[in-house]
C-alpha cells in the first residue's frame, strides 16, 4: 500500500484511567497531513465521536478510560501529498494497585515513570501528562508511599514536584494524581513513579545557557498582555530546575491571589547534543508596578532578567 512502517517502543499502561497517544513524527506531521488511527490492522478507523470511550481527537487516540482488553497494536497512518507513514504502537495494559505493598516493584514501566533525584541537590520529579487540548487537567497532588506529600522541602510547580536538598529518604514509590475533565465527565489519572537516588552530578557539572532573555529591557504599553519566552539550552540528562522569579519568589507564588502574572508550562525540543527548553511568563495586564522590576528566568545556577519599561513618548504625535 506504499506506506512506510515505523515501530514505536512498547508502552506499559495502567488500567481504569485515561490514556492518550499523539501521532506525531516530525518532520512528517509538520506539513499538511491527514492522520487516521486503527487498531490491530483493522480496516475500520477508530471512531471520531467524542462520546466514544476510545476515539480519535485530532492527531491523538484517546482512551476514556483505558481498559484491560485494550491491549494491542495500534496504527496511525499519516498521509501527506506525496508520502504515507504507518506508525505502530504496542500498548500493554496492566492492573496495578499502587498502594498494594504485597506487589514488589512494577512491570517494565516506561522511562518517564522511572526518575532519578540527585543527593544533596535541589531537584524535581515530573508528572508526565500527555493529553489533547480537549482534556482539562486539574491541580496535581503528589504522594509518596501512598501518603500525600507535605513539608517545606516540597513545592508543587505546574507538573513538577520540586524537592530541595534531596536526601536518601526521598527514594521510593511516588504517584502524581490529577482529575481530568472531558466533555463534562471526570476521570482520575494516577501515575506511579519509581524514584531512585544518585550522588553523581549526572550532567558533568555543565552550566545551562540562557539564550533569552539577556538582562534586557522590553518596551510595553500599560494595560497590554505580554508573553515572554525564556529559552535555555542544557545537556540532555540535566537535573536543573527552570522557572521565573520576581523578588526571589516564584511568580506563581508572588502573584498567587491575583494570578495576573503566571509561569507557563515548560516545553522542550531535543537535539543531538542538548535540549532546548522554553518556559514563558504571561502578564495578563501590565501594570505600573511591573515597570523597572527584574523578572528573572532561572535555570540551575544560571539566571537572566527582563525589565519592562514604558515606551518612549512619540513626540511626532504632537
Amino acid at each position: 500500500d506504499g506506506c512506510n512502517d515505523i515501530f514505536m517502543k512498547n508502552e506499559m499502561l495502567s488500567a481504569s484511567q485515561p490514556f492518550a497517544f499523539n501521532c506525531t513524527f516530525p518532520p512528517i506531521t509538520s506539513g499538511e497531513v491527514s492522520v487516521t488511527w486503527y487498531k490491530n490492522s483493522s480496516k475500520i478507523p477508530v471512531s471520531k465521536i467524542i462520546q466514544s470511550r476510545i476515539h480519535q481527537d485530532e492527531t491523538w487516540i484517546l482512551f476514556l478510560p483505558m481498559e484491560w482488553g485494550d491491549s494491542g497494536v495500534y496504527q496511525c497512518v499519516i498521509k501527506g501529498r506525496d508520502s504515507c507513514h504507518r506508525i505502530h504502537v504496542n500498548l500493554t495494559v496492566f492492573e496495578k494497585q499502587w498502594c498494594d505493598t504485597s506487589v514488589k516493584g512494577l512491570p517494565n514501566l516506561s522511562d518517564e515513570y522511572k526518575q532519578i533525584l540527585h543527593l544533596g541537590k535541589d531537584d524535581s520529579l515530573t508528572c508526565h501528562l500527555h493529553f489533547p487540548k480537549s482534556c482539562i487537567l486539574g491541580p496535581i497532588k503528589w504522594y509518596k508511599d501512598c501518603n500525600e506529600i507535605t513539608g517545606e522541602r516540597f513545592t508543587v510547580l505546574e507538573t513538577r514536584l520540586l524537592v530541595s536538598n534531596v536526601s536518601a529518604e526521598d527514594r521510593g514509590n511516588y504517584a502524581c494524581q490529577v482529575i481530568l475533565t472531558h466533555s463534562g465527565k471526570q476521570y482520575e489519572v494516577l501515575n506511579g513513579i519509581t524514584v531512585s537516588i544518585t550522588e553523581r552530578a549526572g550532567y558533568g557539572g555543565s552550566v545551562p545557557k540562557i539564550i533569552y532573555p539577556k538582562n534586557n529591557s522590553i518596551e510595553v504599553q500599560l494595560g497590554t498582555t505580554l508573553i515572554v519566552d525564556c529559552n535555555i539550552t542544557d545537556t540532555k540528562d540535566n537535573t536543573n530546575l527552570r522557572c521565573w522569579r520576581v523578588n526571589n519568589t516564584l511568580v506563581d507564588d508572588y502573584y498567587n491571589e491575583s494570578k495576573r502574572i503566571r509561569e507557563g508550562v515548560e516545553t522542550h525540543a531535543s537535539f543531538r547534543e542538548y535540549n532546548l527548553y522554553t518556559v514563558n511568563i504571561t502578564f495578563l495586564e501590565v501594570k505600573m508596578e511591573d515597570y523597572g522590576l527584574p523578572f528573572m528566568c532561572h535555570a540551575g545556577v544560571s539566571a537572566a532578567y527582563i525589565m519592562l519599561q514604558l515606551p518612549a513618548p512619540d513626540f511626532r504625535a504632537y
Epitope: K114, S196, I197, E199, R200
Partner: antibody
Framework: EVQLQQSGPSLVKPSQTLSLTCSVT??????GYWNWIRNFPGNKLEYM?????????YYNPSLKSRISITRDTSKNQYYLQLISVTTEDTATYYC??????????????WGQGTSVTVSS | EILLTQSPAIMSATLGEKVTMSCRAS?????MYWYQLKSGASPKLWIY???NLASGVPARFSGSGSGTSYSLTISSVEAEDAATYFC?????????FGGGTKLEIK
C-alpha cells in the same frame, strides 16, 4: 531479574583497540547508569566510566583520551572501547549497574567479567 | 581526586573474632559503599549508603562512619567471610575505590 552478559576478546595486541560488549536483560538501558570497572592483577579496582539513561557519558579523567562508552538501545547493549592499549591495561573488565533499593550508585548487578591480556 | 585508604591491607582473624576494617577518605564523602571480592568471582555489593546491608549479606556485618572516616565491622567472623573488601565513593568524580582489605581466616 537484571542480568549482564559480557562478551569480547581475551587477548589484545599492544596499540590495538580493546572492545567489549555488555548485553542487558531484565532492565532497559534507557533507565539508570551503566558502568564499566576493571580489576588489575593484584586486586586494584578502577572505576572507568558510565553511560547514563539519556546517553550522557562520564569517563575517568585518567582514561579520557582513550575510552569510549556507547550503547545500542534497540539491542539493549552497551559497549566499552579502549584505544591504544598497553600491557598496563591487562585486567579483568566488568560491566555493572545499580538501582538496588532505589540507589543508582549501589552496584548490585555485575557481568561475569572478561579477563583481558594485552600482549604481542 | 578523593583518595580512599583502606587499612589494614591484610588482616588475619580467628573464627568467632570481631574484626573492623577502616576506609579513610582524603576529603569528605557523603556515603560509602563496600564490595566483597572473592577469587574468580565478580565483586558483590556488600554495604550501601554507609550502613545498609545488601540482600543476602549476613547480619554479623555492619557499616558505619561519616565525613572522612568509615568502617566495616564483622561481629563474629566465619570461614565464608574470607575475601577482599573494597570501599568506594560516588560523592566526587573521579569515582574511586580503596586499595582493599584482604581478610584471611587463621
Amino acid at each position: 531479574e537484571v542480568q549482564l552478559q559480557q562478551s569480547g576478546p581475551s587477548l589484545v595486541k599492544p596499540s590495538q583497540t580493546l572492545s567489549l560488549t555488555c548485553s542487558v536483560t531484565g532492565a532497559s538501558i534507557t533507565s539508570g547508569y551503566w558502568n564499566w570497572i576493571r580489576n588489575f592483577p593484584g586486586n586494584k579496582l578502577e572505576y572507568m566510566g558510565y553511560i547514563s539513561y539519556s546517553g550522557y557519558t562520564y569517563y575517568n579523567p585518567s582514561l579520557k583520551s582513550r575510552i569510549s562508552i556507547t550503547r545500542d538501545t534497540s539491542k539493549n547493549q552497551y559497549y566499552l572501547q579502549l584505544i591504544s592499549v598497553t600491557t598496563e591495561d591487562t585486567a579483568t573488565y566488568y560491566c555493572a549497574t545499580g538501582g538496588y533499593d532505589y540507589v543508582e550508585d549501589a552496584l548490585y548487578y555485575w557481568g561475569q567479567g572478561t579477563s583481558v591480556t594485552v600482549s604481542s | 581526586e578523593i583518595l580512599l585508604t583502606q587499612s589494614p591491607a591484610i588482616m588475619s582473624a580467628t573464627l568467632g573474632e570481631k574484626v573492623t576494617m577502616s576506609c579513610r577518605a582524603s576529603s569528605n564523602v557523603r556515603y560509602m559503599y563496600w564490595y566483597q571480592l572473592k577469587s574468580g568471582a565478580s565483586p558483590k555489593l556488600w554495604i550501601y549508603l554507609t550502613s545498609n546491608l545488601a540482600s543476602g549479606v549476613p547480619a554479623r556485618f555492619s557499616g558505619s562512619g561519616s565525613g572522612t572516616s568509615y568502617s566495616l565491622t564483622i561481629s563474629s567472623v566465619e570461614a565464608e567471610d574470607a575475601a577482599t573488601y573494597f570501599c568506594q565513593q560516588f560523592t566526587t568524580s573521579p569515582y574511586t575505590f580503596g586499595g582493599g582489605t584482604k581478610l584471611e581466616i587463621k
